[in-house]
């Protein structure tokens, strides 16, 4: 176990032309915060894929207001380190994503607005216990300068935090073949050596000489990937040739839970139910009580004060797991209707609604037809967060209260004269034309072009347009 630490030194415009505009203004003051996401190995995974090694969010930085006319300077940063605890061995190779977020502090409806300013990513090799590594990454016109390191939490030591240190049994020296644990010179390295050849990336051990595999790997030395598509031969599954099984061994095969813990498969991983007095991803940590603070993310610990009594973490909304270590993104399925913005506040979901909508999930159309009357026989039509009236002939305007001039658009063709009428308009056609809008020429022999004149109407009579 250990902690990955990230120190942000500066975030501001990068060198070269095209300096970015300041993200904050006098009208919209804002402050920055950072998110780091770590994944094991040198994978080039999508930014959305899980942060399998862990993730952390910084505190909010100081409020910043742009000075008018000044170029964007290095922006004020949050205090402190970003710390990502890891429970198992440090993988040595890792991928990172660092995101810079802006929190606008103007008069926002429903709380502050967040937007992603920049995202940088990289793949690095890093030994635990080493010095701070410095880095510069650019995202568009922005530049991020930072340092990072991985350090082991006692009693773990070593480049992967897999060796354990124990207090000396004798005051003067360590036992045969055991070295002092630098920098803890008063402690000695515990004799924990995994089976020779055990994969340092995919295997681990909790007892000397063993080699236990992380999920996705199998074989005596954890060097064989399981459940890959190459396992299928034309005659069906074959484990002899490829060393893999289909269906692949489940994550609970071989029981990764230590100290008598029982394993259950979860949708994508496994979970250990630990006996009293143990906790951790694999029940590897002993003698834990509520006094040790085993519940993460604000979980409430309930249990006895002595190491033999079990504790239970009651997780706040948005977290789960035996130690409330798993975060749930409840906005993932877009619960906010009508284009509302979803905010997972931890204790609750909140929707910031677009103009024209309201309600806990933005489900209410404020401008709908409820209680809206269209005058003079008009009918109300809903749509897009607004309502409109479809007006009866002779009326117009938002609520059909205005008398429309049906002749305004000059509807009578070929010089016909237009007369407003209570049910619409009437065209008095010029000689030689007929039809509701005087659109049909009259032939010399008295026959008209299609359509035929209605009975009782002579060419040249006024035509009522309904």
């Amino acid at each position: 176990a250990g902690v990955f630490e990230l120190q942000i030194h500066s975030f501001g415009p990068g060198p070269g032309p095209g300096a970015p505009r300041s993200p904050c203004s006098a009208r919209l003051p804002c402050r920055l915060f950072f998110r780091v996401c770590l994944k094991p190995g040198l994978s080039e995974e999508a930014a959305e894929s899980p942060c399998a090694l862990g993730a952390a969010l910084s505190a909010r930085g100081p409020v910043y207001t742009e000075q008018p006319g000044a170029p964007a300077p290095d922006l004020p940063l949050p205090d402190g380190l970003l710390q990502v605890p890891f429970r198992d061995a440090w993988p040595g190779t890792f991928s990172f994503i660092i995101e810079t977020w802006r929190e606008e502090l103007g008069d926002q409806i429903g709380g502050p607005a967040w937007s992603l300013l920049a995202r940088v990513a990289g793949r690095r090799r890093l030994a635990a216990g080493g010095p701070w590594a410095r880095d510069i990454q650019r995202a568009g016109a922005w530049e991020l300068r930072f340092s990072y390191r991985a350090r082991c939490e006692p009693p773990a030591v070593g480049t992967a935090c897999t060796r354990l240190c124990r207090p000396r049994s004798a005051p003067s020296r360590c036992g045969p073949g055991l070295r002092p644990c630098a920098p803890l010179e008063d402690e000695c390295e515990a004799p924990l050596v995994c089976r020779a050849g055990c994969s340092p990336e995919h295997g681990f051990c909790e007892q000397p000489g063993e080699c236990r595999c992380l999920e996705g790997w199998t074989g005596p030395l954890c060097t064989v990937p399981v459940s890959t598509s190459s396992c299928l031969s034309p005659r069906g599954p074959s484990s002899a040739t490829t060393g893999c099984l289909v269906p692949g061994p489940g994550p609970c095969d071989g029981n990764p839970c230590a100290n008598g813990g029982s394993c259950s498969e979860t949708p994508r991983s496994f979970e250990c139910t630990c006996p009293r007095g143990f906790y951790g991803l694999r029940c590897e940590v002993s003698g834990v009580t509520c006094a040790d603070g085993p519940c993460f993310n604000g979980g409430l610990c309930v249990g006895g004060a002595d190491p033999d009594s079990a504790y239970i973490c009651h997780c706040p909304p948005g977290f789960q797991g035996s130690n409330c270590e798993k975060r749930v993104d409840r906005c993932s399925l877009q619960p906010c209707r009508n284009g509302g913005l979803c905010l997972d506040l931890g204790h609750a979901l909140r929707c910031r609604c677009r103009a024209g909508f309201a309600g806990p999930r933005c489900e209410h159309d404020l401008d709908d037809c409820a209680g809206r009357a269209c005058a003079n026989g008009g009918t109300c039509v809903e749509g897009g967060g607004a309502h409109r009236c479809s007006c009866a002939l002779g009326f117009g305007g938002r609520d059909c209260r205005e008398r429309a001039d049906p002749c305004a658009a000059r509807p009578c063709a070929h010089g016909g004269r237009c007369y407003a009428h209570f049910s619409g308009l009437v065209c008095a056609c010029a000689p030689g034309y007929m039809g509701a809008r005087c659109e049909f020429p009259v032939h010399p022999d008295g026959a008209s072009a299609l359509p035929a004149a209605p009975p009782g109407l002579r060419p040249g009579d006024p035509q009522r347009y309904l």
Epitope: S49, S264, T266, R268, V328, L333
Partner: antibody
Framework: QITLKESGPTLVKPTQTLTLTCTFS??????????VGWIRQPPGKALEWLAH???????RYSPSLKSRLTITKDTSKNQVVLTMTNMDPVDTATYYC????????????????WGQGTLVTVSS | DIQMTQSPSSLSASVGDRVTITCSAS?????MYWYQQKPGKAPKLLIY???NLASGVPSRFSGSGSGTDFTLTISSLQPEDFATYYC?????????FGQGTKLEIK
């Protein structure tokens, strides 16, 4: 628009192997967070989860049927295939495939879109 | 295995009634999922992550609960709500469903 459709034989004989294909559109199994699962429902009975597969090829099987089930995906064809060996009349059911979404490492957000289902009868 | 027990197994109610269906799990878990199924049709997601309404589901449906006891509530029954309702847990394999609650017109 997201759709899923199950296809396969409607009648199989006891001891035979059933192969069902789920063809989907509107999402991709190369996208992080996406999965496809199989669920069945014997006539007049409750739903039973069988298996699922994730974008990164992590698979899960119902323990009581694990020895008989295999789930695979063909990302380029937008298909997931479930094979079930040694069929028995008690396996007669409507078989559904459904999209599963997980935006967190180990928490299912939802099984939000389902196919119409295909009725498979096991009889000699 | 986590057993999911729904109650009641069947229920008669009238349009406009407030209806509550409960689902009890044999061991504690974090989230519940609810589905509605009509005869001859595929199940439809109603509630995910215990209390979140799926897209297109009317706001008269709501979900609540934690630990082992979870509830689906329909605030005012509509004719189209008469169907069978299932709960499901995604905590531990096998990912089990409840036996169903059939909601019928009184």
């Amino acid at each position: 628009q997201i759709t899923l459709k199950e296809s396969g034989p409607t009648l199989v004989k006891p001891t035979q192997t059933l192969t069902l294909t789920c063809t989907f559109s509107g999402f991709s199994l190369s996208t992080s967070g996406m999965g496809v699962g199989w669920i069945r429902q014997p006539p007049g009975k409750a739903l039973e989860w069988l298996a699922h597969i994730w974008w990164d090829d992590v698979k899960r099987y119902s323990p009581s049927l694990k020895s008989r089930l295999t789930i695979t995906k063909d990302t380029s064809k937008n298909q997931v295939v479930l094979t079930m060996t040694n069929m028995d009349p008690v396996d007669t059911a409507t078989y559904y495939c459904a999209r599963i979404v997980s935006f967190d490492n180990d928490v299912v957000s939802a099984m939000d879109y389902w196919g119409q289902g295909t009725l498979v009868t096991v009889s000699s | 295995d986590i057993q999911m027990t729904q109650s009641p197994s069947s229920l008669s109610a009238s349009v406009g009634d407030r209806v509550t269906i409960t689902c009890s799990a044999s061991s504690s878990h974090s989230y519940m999922y609810w589905y509605q199924q009509k005869p001859g049709k595929a199940p439809k997601l109603l509630i995910y992550l215990t209390s979140n309404l799926a897209s297109g589901v009317p706001s008269r449906f709501s979900g609540s609960g934690s630990g082992t006891d979870f509830t689906l509530t329909i605030s005012s029954l509509q004719p189209e709500d008469f169907a069978t309702y299932y709960c499901q847990q995604w905590r531990s394999n096998p990912f089990t469903f409840g036996q169903g609650t059939k909601l019928e017109i009184k």
